[in-house]
Amino acid sequence: GKKEKPEKKVKKSDCGEWQWSVCVPTSGDCGLGTREGTRTGAECKQTMKTQRCKIPCNWKKQFGAECKYQFQAWGECDLNTALKTRTGSLKRALHNAECQKTVTISKPCGKLTKPKPQAESKKKKKEGKKQEKMLD
């Protein structure tokens, strides 16, 4: 008969593959969250672990489309994170929606070179107008 291949010896310390749950956001239905990992193995020391994960989202989805916020101007660029942030305060909650009272959104600063003075003044004007509007 056919010679059977010798079975691979399974070490006592061997563990099964990690099986991961879906990413569960810490807050809202996207953004930073955690996922649970499990694996089998009789002699496996670590059979469970939690891992940080992220579900991408735009801020509108993250804070609920029924939640309307008034935002401040963008803050200065944080050189450590290369992000700038701004805070919004709740103005209106449509249909009894459950909304966070204040929210913070971040975006990359882009290149940290000084913009041309003309572009800068135009941008400031635009930001001022935008601020007056209540943003969705």
């Epitope: 807050s27 239905d29 993250q62 609920g64 489309a65 029924e66 939640c67 249909h95 009272k101």
Partner: antibody
Framework: QVQLQQSGPELVKPGASVKISCQAS????????MNWVKQRPGKGLEWIGR????????LYNGKFKGKATLTADKSSTTVYMQLSSLTSEDSAVYFC?????????????WGQGTLVTVSA | DIVMTQSPSSLAMSVGQKVTLSCRSS????????????LAWYQQKPGQSPKLLVY??IRESGVPDRFIGSGSGTDFTLTITSVQAEDLADYFC?????????FGAGTKLELK
């Protein structure tokens, strides 16, 4: 993951008050509203109100104003509901409940319920 | 307050049958600006907390695809395409169009 753990059953006398609790874990407690829902035996569900633990802001169903008082303790991530001047009509299971995300008020997370029995 | 009316109050079905539960609201739950219906369905098994099944006709994660939410405006339906023994429960609809949030009185699903 989000967990809502409610306090145990209560047997109280008519006219007295009772304070039941709902301890939350697994999420940013301060920035999510917590709701309370009443269910009388064999009856439907009634929304009592909700509280925002971040600043203690609350919103009540008019029917329960003066009957229920909602408070929150950020240090223990616990929301409380006090029911006053109890009558047999207040005998019910009370649930705390939370939405999954910001936005529409449908409840994805529920506590296991606290049975309040009002009896002389 | 918006009044939610469910029918029937109870019904007995055999495993494999199709079940249709009805929920009517005293005013429209449809926002014409975003075309969203502000209605949810819950299942409550004896001695348990309610469980979210469907919101705005979207099935909650982990809910079997035999549960289908439909309808718009004031008339809504929860259909169980092939009822299973584990579906024995009370079913409630809830409006979240305006405060106070209100629930239907429920439909008790029993098995023949």
């Amino acid at each position: 993951q989000v967990q809502l753990q409610q306090s145990g059953p209560e047997l109280v006398k008519p006219g007295a008050s009772v304070k039941i609790s709902c301890q939350a874990s697994g999420y940013a407690f301060s920035s999510h509203w917590m709701n309370w829902v009443k269910q009388r035996p064999g009856k439907g569900l009634e929304w009592i109100g909700r509280i925002y633990p971040g600043d203690g802001d609350s919103l009540y169903n008019g029917k329960f104003k003066g009957k229920a008082t909602l408070t929150a303790d950020k240090s223990s991530t616990t929301v409380y509901m006090q029911l006053s001047s109890l009558t047999s009509e207040d005998s019910a299971v009370y649930f705390c409940a939370r939405t999954r995300a910001y936005g529409p008020a449908w409840f994805a997370y529920w506590g296991q319920g606290t049975l309040v029995t009002v009896s002389a | 307050d918006i009044v939610m009316t469910q029918s029937p109050s109870s019904l007995a079905m055999s495993v494999g049958q199709k079940v249709t539960l009805s929920c009517r609201s005293s005013q429209s739950l449809l926002d014409s600006n975003n075309q969203k219906n502000y209605l949810a369905w819950y299942q409550q098994k004896p001695g348990q907390s309610p469980k979210l099944l469907v919101y705005a006709s979207i099935r909650e994660s982990g809910v079997p695809d035999r549960f289908i939410g439909s309808g718009s405006g004031t008339d809504f339906t929860l259909t169980i395409t092939s009822v299973q023994a584990e579906d024995l429960a009370d079913y409630f609809c809830q409006q979240h169009y305006s405060t106070p949030l209100t629930f239907g009185a429920g439909t008790k699903l029993e098995l023949k």
